[in-house]
Interface confidence: low
């Protein structure tokens, strides 16, 4: 019979190749059947008999058409910082991915080998680049006129509220505190409304901690990163 309608096993034409889902057995020198996903070759073919396939045992798999003598072992159970997004079946390996709040620090062909907790940006710092499945959060100091008062892997720096009358000027880790009603939120990050009176130094200055500031006391323009004041809260 011509090769294209032959039943396995068969000898390929000189210079020819075996068909899809077949392989060339060097020992038998014949084109033989591959085993489907979820099975493996229990008995290899001969000149007169085709491959004998058998189902994979528990906790083993084959994902592709194959002629392997044994199925592949599924990976170990997912660790506590991972979730199983694909169970181990006869046709597919277990896939472990990092749980929310974590990212894959060391990946493997499928899933993740090592998860790491996403960096938290501390007060005075906001997320400059969010974490992804395979990359960590990048934090950046809050720019002038913005703040973050949280320890978070997701919060960005937010604009200070604009006050009619400023009780305490905001800094990188604390919102401005207003004495008047109806404060407005700055639309443009970096917009800084100065309290009066104000003492301005160089462009990079820090707010001086002043827990009990008397009326008329000069404030420093709050600019640049600043770690948190103990017990401080936004307005």
């Amino acid at each position: 019979l011509p090769a294209q309608v032959a039943f396995t096993p068969y000898a390929p034409e000189p210079g020819g190749t075996c068909r899809l889902r077949e392989y060339y057995d060097q020992t038998a020198q014949m084109c033989c059947s591959k085993c489907p996903p979820g099975q493996h070759a229990k008995v290899f073919c001969t000149k007169t008999s085709d491959t004998v396939c058998d189902s994979c045992e528990d906790s083993t798999y084959t994902q592709l058409w194959n002629w392997v003598p044994e199925c592949l072992s599924c990976g170990s159970r997912c660790s506590s910082d991972q979730v199983e997004t694909q169970a181990c079946t006869r046709e597919q390996n277990r896939i472990c991915t990092c749980r929310p709040g974590w990212y894959c620090a060391l990946s493997k062909q499928e899933g993740c080998r090592l998860c790491a907790q996403l960096r938290k940006c501390r007060p005075g710092f906001g997320v400059a680049r969010p974490g992804t499945e395979t990359s960590d959060v990048v934090c950046k100091p809050c720019a002038p006129g913005t703040f973050s008062n949280t320890t978070s892997s997701t919060d960005i720096c937010r604009p200070h509220q604009i006050c009619h009358v400023v009780a305490i000027p905001g800094n990188a880790s604390m919102d401005a505190v207003c004495t008047s009603t109806s404060p407005t939120r700055s639309m443009a990050p970096g917009a800084v409304h100065l309290p009066q009176p104000v003492s301005t130094r160089s462009q990079h200055t820090q707010p001086t901690p002043a827990p009990s500031t008397a009326p008329g006391t000069s404030f420093l323009l709050p600019v640049g990163p600043s770690p948190p004041a103990e017990g401080s809260t936004g307005d």
């Epitope: 938290k120 827990p211 600043s226 770690p227």
Partner: antibody, heavy 123, light 110 residues
Framework: EVQLVESGGGLVQPGGSLRLSCAAS????????MTWVRQAPGKGLEWVGI???????YYATWAKGRFTISRDNSKNTLYLQMNSLRAEDTAVYYC?????????????????WGQGTLVTVSS | DIQMTQSPSSVSASVGDRVTITCQAS??????LAWYQQKPGKAPKLLIY???KLASGVPSRFSGSGSGTDFTLTISSLQPEDFATYYC????????????FGGGTKVEIK
């Protein structure tokens, strides 16, 4: 093993320039705040400046304008460019990494430190 | 400009003594203070961070306390290897700052 190794120190004339390098191994430089600290012979520690994870640099008031901190993430190396050097800049220069304790981006304490490199400014 | 003032500048003590070094910040720095030990010809070594937390591998005879502006490093029972210079360092602000380190305290053998 986490390690920092400084290089580039040596003798330079007043008014000259020098670039110090700090090669990091065992961690990614871009994931931490990095600082430069110097120590004049027989004197205490003096902070030079710091570079954050976003690549922004901050300097001691006396270092602004003359000193520049930068880094090359591909080489995992930190740099200190020093210009208009004076005799009083003679010191051992150390690079150090922010500890990052608590998973914070910046913990405000430094460990490990490099072994230091000596810069001598003299005619 | 936050100033860090350490005292005393030097102290003579014997093995087994309790040694206390103080560090004062000119402004409130909350708990953002670290202590370092430095021996001649060597790089500084972190002892304490966030005012009272012991760094990895540091013996428990070292302890730190304080918050706000006043801080203390205590060596409960001085050992021969503890003779060195100790520095405090504020980690609160690094903008518009002259130096984040204190002047140092040399612990010498009596």
């Amino acid at each position: 093993e986490v390690q920092l190794v400084e290089s580039g120190g040596g003798l330079v004339q007043p008014g000259g320039s020098l670039r110090l390098s700090c090669a990091a191994s065992g961690f990614s430089l871009s994931d931490y705040f990095m600082t430069w600290v110097r120590q004049a012979p027989g004197k205490g520690l003096e902070w030079v400046g710091i570079i954050n994870t976003g690549g922004d640099s901050y300097y001691a008031t006396w270092a602004k304008g003359r000193f520049t901190i930068s880094r090359d993430n591909s080489k995992n190396t930190l740099y200190l460019q020093m210009n208009s050097l004076r005799a009083e800049d003679t010191a051992v220069y150390y690079c150090a990494r922010d500890t990052g304790y608590g998973g914070y981006d910046y913990a405000g304490s430094f460990d490990p430190w490099g072994q230091g490199t000596l810069v001598t400014v003299s005619s | 400009d936050i100033q860090m003032t350490q005292s005393p500048s030097s102290v003579s003590a014997s093995v087994g003594d309790r040694v206390t070094i103080t560090c004062q910040a000119s402004e409130n720095i909350n708990s953002w203070l670290a202590w370092y030990q430095q021996k001649p010809g060597k790089a500084p070594k972190l002892l304490i961070y966030e005012a009272s937390k012991l760094a990895s591998g540091v013996p428990s005879r070292f302890s730190g306390s304080g918050s706000g502006t006043d801080f203390t490093l205590t060596i409960s029972s001085l050992q021969p290897e503890d003779f060195a210079t100790y520095y405090c360092q504020q980690g609160y602000i690094y903008i518009d700052v002259g130096n984040i380190f204190g002047g140092g305290t040399k612990v010498e053998i009596k």
